[in-house]
């Protein structure tokens, strides 16, 4: 690469959140070069040594990748070409949490970029009229989060007011020993009103909505990713 | 069109070693888009996954066989192989070599047909 | 390491029946999931892959669905080419892990 070392490329990165045991992705791109042979992707992860992933001469080359990354890692091969350097990453771990970098190198020059990856688990939560308690209550369950969330009700009716003492919420350890289910359960609701459900962490914040009425249920959830 | 063939002795006595040989044509096992594992099929049960190596010699192996698996890379042959050693009984099946789809997904395809190998004195 | 349990162990069909084979894993496998179909004396062959992506040159009654830990296979019309044995296979991490094995057998 006789220019590779003159010339500077542009690369961007972005950060982002993966759900542990799903698969995620590490988002980079870079000024696309048609010459797929003469694009080399590295993936580095801060404080590990070897590579994440390593793509060149149009290939994968995982001669360098360290261990805990083996078998968990791709590129979209198919669009290098057009500047996407993003990194697949397989059943996503709390330890992949950190900082990496997406170092590249082209007919064009070279650049990098670093991004902040973080881990956790977050689910959208189903919330349900609760027929078997004494008086009308929900139940808000989501079955998977971490690290712990902290849970909160509001109505449309009784904008502002504080539902801690009516609501019980509790964090059920899930098999694998990480991620926890959350259930919550508020009391004395009223018919003809739209409660909601917040679950939030510092990864992201999901929210579930029901409002029920004499002749109907109607349900509604989102998830959104915190600072990503 | 990628094949796969297995070769080595198809009886071993107890206590011995097992090694096997798998002949890659139609393709490069140098090719880093790929794992290479080992995979056996004890008589009339199910299949079992023994581990894999990379055309750099990196390996990892089923923790269950750990203790006495070894596999090998020749990429100037276009061979990889398995030994296992203080072989028993039990390690009698059919032993295959395949290719993982790619490095992120590791189903098998394609395979070799296979060899049977029987640990008898 | 994560278990693969197949059901049923045996399931007796006629052509041109639909038959669904289920495969459990013992914690989430998201979509990583393989199908494998096996004849006496012959090497496993690849049917499905990423629980639902029929593999090429593969029959296209032939299907997979499911994600986490439930998955199905699917063959829509059996043909008597499929009577044979059928192997799941969870590729989510390290042991990899196959199926106890479904044998489809001619009813």
């Known amino acids: 690469f006789g220019i590779s070392g003159k010339h500077f490329i542009t690369v961007t990165t972005f950060t982002s959140a993966g759900n542990i045991g799903e698969d995620g992705t590490l988002s980079c791109t870079f000024e696309p070069d048609i010459k797929l042979n003469g694009i080399v992707i590295q993936w580095l992860k801060e404080g590990i040594k070897g590579l994440v992933h390593e793509f060149k001469e149009g290939k994968d080359d995982l001669s360098q990748q360290h261990e805990m990354f083996r078998g968990r890692t791709a590129v979209f091969a198919d669009q290098v070409v057009v500047g996407n350097a993003s990194l697949r990453l397989k059943n996503v771990q709390l330890t992949d949490a950190g900082t990496y970098t997406c170092y590249i190198r082209t007919s064009k020059g070279k650049g990098n970029a670093n991004l902040e990856y973080k881990t956790g688990a977050f689910s959208m939560p189903e919330i349900n009229v609760d027929y078997n308690a004494s008086s009308e209550s929900l139940r808000c369950e989501a079955p998977r989060w971490f690290p712990q969330p902290t849970v909160a009700w509001a109505s449309q009716v009784d904008q502002g007011a504080n539902f801690s003492e009516v609501s019980n919420t509790s964090f059920e350890l899930n098999s694998e020993n990480v991620t926890m289910k959350v259930v919550s359960v508020l009391y004395n609701v009223t018919i003809n009103n739209t409660y909601s459900c917040m679950i939030e962490n510092d990864i992201a914040k999901a929210t579930g909505d029901i409002k029920v009425t004499d002749s109907e249920v109607k349900r509604r959830s989102q998830l959104q990713l915190l600072n990503s | 069109q990628l094949q796969l063939q297995e070769s080595g002795p198809g009886l071993v006595k107890p206590s011995e070693t097992l090694s096997l040989t798998c002949t890659v044509s139609g393709g490069s096992i140098s090719d880093g888009s790929y794992y290479w594992s080992w995979i056996r099929q004890h008589p009339g049960k199910g299949l079992e996954w023994i581990g894999n190596?990379?055309?750099?010699?990196?390996?990892y192996y089923n923790p269950s066989l750990r203790s006495r698996v070894t596999m090998s890379v020749d990429t100037s042959k276009n061979q990889f192989s398995l030994k296992l050693s203080s072989v028993t009984a039990a390690d009698t099946a059919v032993y295959y070599c395949?290719?993982?789809?790619?490095?992120?997904?590791?189903?098998?395809?394609?395979w070799g047909q296979g060899t049977l190998v029987t640990v008898s004195s | 390491d994560i278990q693969m349990t197949q059901s049923p162990s045996t399931l007796s069909a006629s052509v041109g029946d639909r038959v669904t084979i289920t495969c459990r894993a013992s914690q989430s496998i998201s979509s990583w999931l393989a199908w494998y179909q096996q004849k006496p004396g012959k090497a496993p062959k690849l049917l499905i892959y990423k629980a639902s992506s029929l593999e090429s040159g593969v029959p296209s009654r032939f299907s997979g669905s499911g994600s986490g830990t439930e998955f199905t296979l699917t063959i829509s019309s059996l043909q008597p080419d499929d009577f044979a044995t059928y192997y799941c296979q969870q590729d989510n991490s390290y042991p990899y892990t196959f199926g106890g094995g479904t044998k489809v057998e001619i009813k």
């Open positions: 190596i990379y055309y750099s010699g990196s390996t």
């Open positions: 395949a290719r993982g789809l790619s490095t992120i997904d590791e189903a098998f395809d394609p």
